[in-house]
């Protein structure tokens, strides 16, 4: 049985997908089916993350790398790694603890995930609405009055609902 | 779905060489260290040789070592046993498998005999 | 190296009947053991890791046991389709090693 020593630390010659045990004359082992090491010189080999329930497997786990989940259809991720799913609501809506619910008057929401945010205040940079917002959707601000050539009429900002002045992120 | 097809196998001459490959699908063949084992006509199963994931670390049973070659080619997604200085005893089928051990192809023989 | 010495070297059982393999190391090999299934023609199939594992779609009538150096294959009720070799082997070091084989018949 041939094999390569380090003068240094025996384990470092262990690569990936194997293990190492300083208490052996033999030190390297390969990692157990669903197990994995992502990089050499390991004295354990990690349990292979299972995607189940709700998680589903976007990748999987090899002998040198962890498997990883994304969520079902009508989930989404939240966290490092996907370490939570989320359900989904529609545009226009945000989840709270009831399930999901319609945003109020003056927010909105464009994505299937998040909170329902305030519509930009077109006033407080001295512009006009030029295309008023919806649940689904923030206004479109437009020139300032001063801009518009005379005789144009401006639109009158709807009043929000929440504080204003935050701008979508 | 993991499959590991073997093949290079055949009648070869005693101190002859025979090279055998083994295409890896439906798994990250890169991510794999990868097994060759080897079976003589009914007999149990031998370890021959193990590469580990990235090619750098090469193990060899006693018996085959100074005469055969593991390598592999992961942008081909396949293993490889070069084999030299070929003996009668050589004679197995042979067969691939990741280093979890846990899917193994479907072997190709090889017969050294003159 | 380390020696897997499986036994018996053959069986003949009844369908039904409950089987019991052993497996023994010549060394500690802590529960670095597997237990893997070979049909006349065909390439083995991995049915127990880690001694006792069962393997993703092996059925429940497998059972692994043991530890350090004695280890067991237990077929609860022997079924047509398992008349095939058994071998053990052990990963819990280079060179890996297998075991012989029993060689499981049918009445």
């Known amino acids: 049985f041939e094999r390569t020593r380090s003068l240094q630390d025996p384990c470092s010659n262990c690569p990936a997908g194997t293990f190492c045990d300083n208490n052996r004359n033999q030190i390297c082992s390969p990692c157990p089916p669903n197990s994995f090491s992502s990089a050499g010189g390991q004295r354990t080999c990690d349990i292979c993350r299972q995607c189940k329930g709700v998680f589903r497997t976007r990748k999987e786990c090899s002998s040198t790398s962890n498997a990883e989940c994304d969520c079902t259809p009508g989930f989404h991720c939240l966290g490092a790694g996907c370490s939570m799913c989320e359900q989904d609501c529609k545009q226009g809506q945000e989840l709270t603890k009831k399930g999901c619910k319609d945003c109020c008057f003056g927010t909105f929401n464009d994505q299937k995930r998040g909170i329902c945010r305030p519509w930009t205040n077109c006033s407080l940079d001295g512009k006009s609405v030029l295309v008023n917002g919806t649940k689904e959707r923030d206004v479109v601000c437009g020139p300032s009055p001063a801009d518009l050539s005379p005789g144009a009429s401006s639109v009158t900002p709807p009043a929000p609902a929440r504080e204003p002045g935050h701008s979508p992120q | 779905e993991v499959q590991l097809v073997e093949s290079g196998g055949g009648l070869v001459k005693p101190g002859g060489s025979r090279k055998l490959s083994c295409a890896a699908s439906?798994?990250?063949?890169?991510?794999?260290?990868m097994h060759w084992v080897r079976q003589a006509p009914d007999k149990g199963l031998k370890w021959v040789a193990y590469i580990s994931s990235g090619g750098s670390t090469i193990y060899y049973a006693d018996t085959v070592k100074g005469r055969f070659t593991i390598s592999r080619d992961n942008a081909k997604n396949t293993l490889f046993l070069q084999m030299t200085s070929l003996r009668s005893e050589d004679t197995a089928m042979y067969y691939c498998?990741?280093?979890?051990?846990?899917?193994w192809g479907q072997g190709t023989t090889l017969t050294v005999s003159s | 190296n380390i020696v897997m010495t499986q036994s018996p070297k053959s069986m003949s059982m009844s369908v039904g009947e409950r089987v019991t393999l052993s497996c023994k190391a010549s060394?500690?090999?802590?529960?670095?053991v597997s237990w893997y299934q070979q049909k006349p023609e065909k390439s083995p199939k991995l049915l127990i890791y880690?001694?006792?594992n069962r393997y993703t779609g092996v059925p429940d009538r497998f059972t692994g046991s043991g530890s350090a150096t004695d280890f067991t294959l237990t077929i609860s009720s022997v079924q047509a389709e398992d008349l095939a070799d058994y071998h053990c082997?052990?990963?819990?070091?280079?060179?890996?090693?297998f075991g012989a084989g029993t060689k499981l018949e049918l009445k």
């Open positions: 060394e500690n090999v802590g529960s670095y």
């Open positions: 082997g052990q990963s819990y070091s280079y060179p890996l090693t």
């Open positions: 880690g001694a006792s």
């Open positions: 498998a990741r280093d979890w051990v846990d899917y």
């Open positions: 439906g798994f990250t063949f890169s991510e794999f260290g």
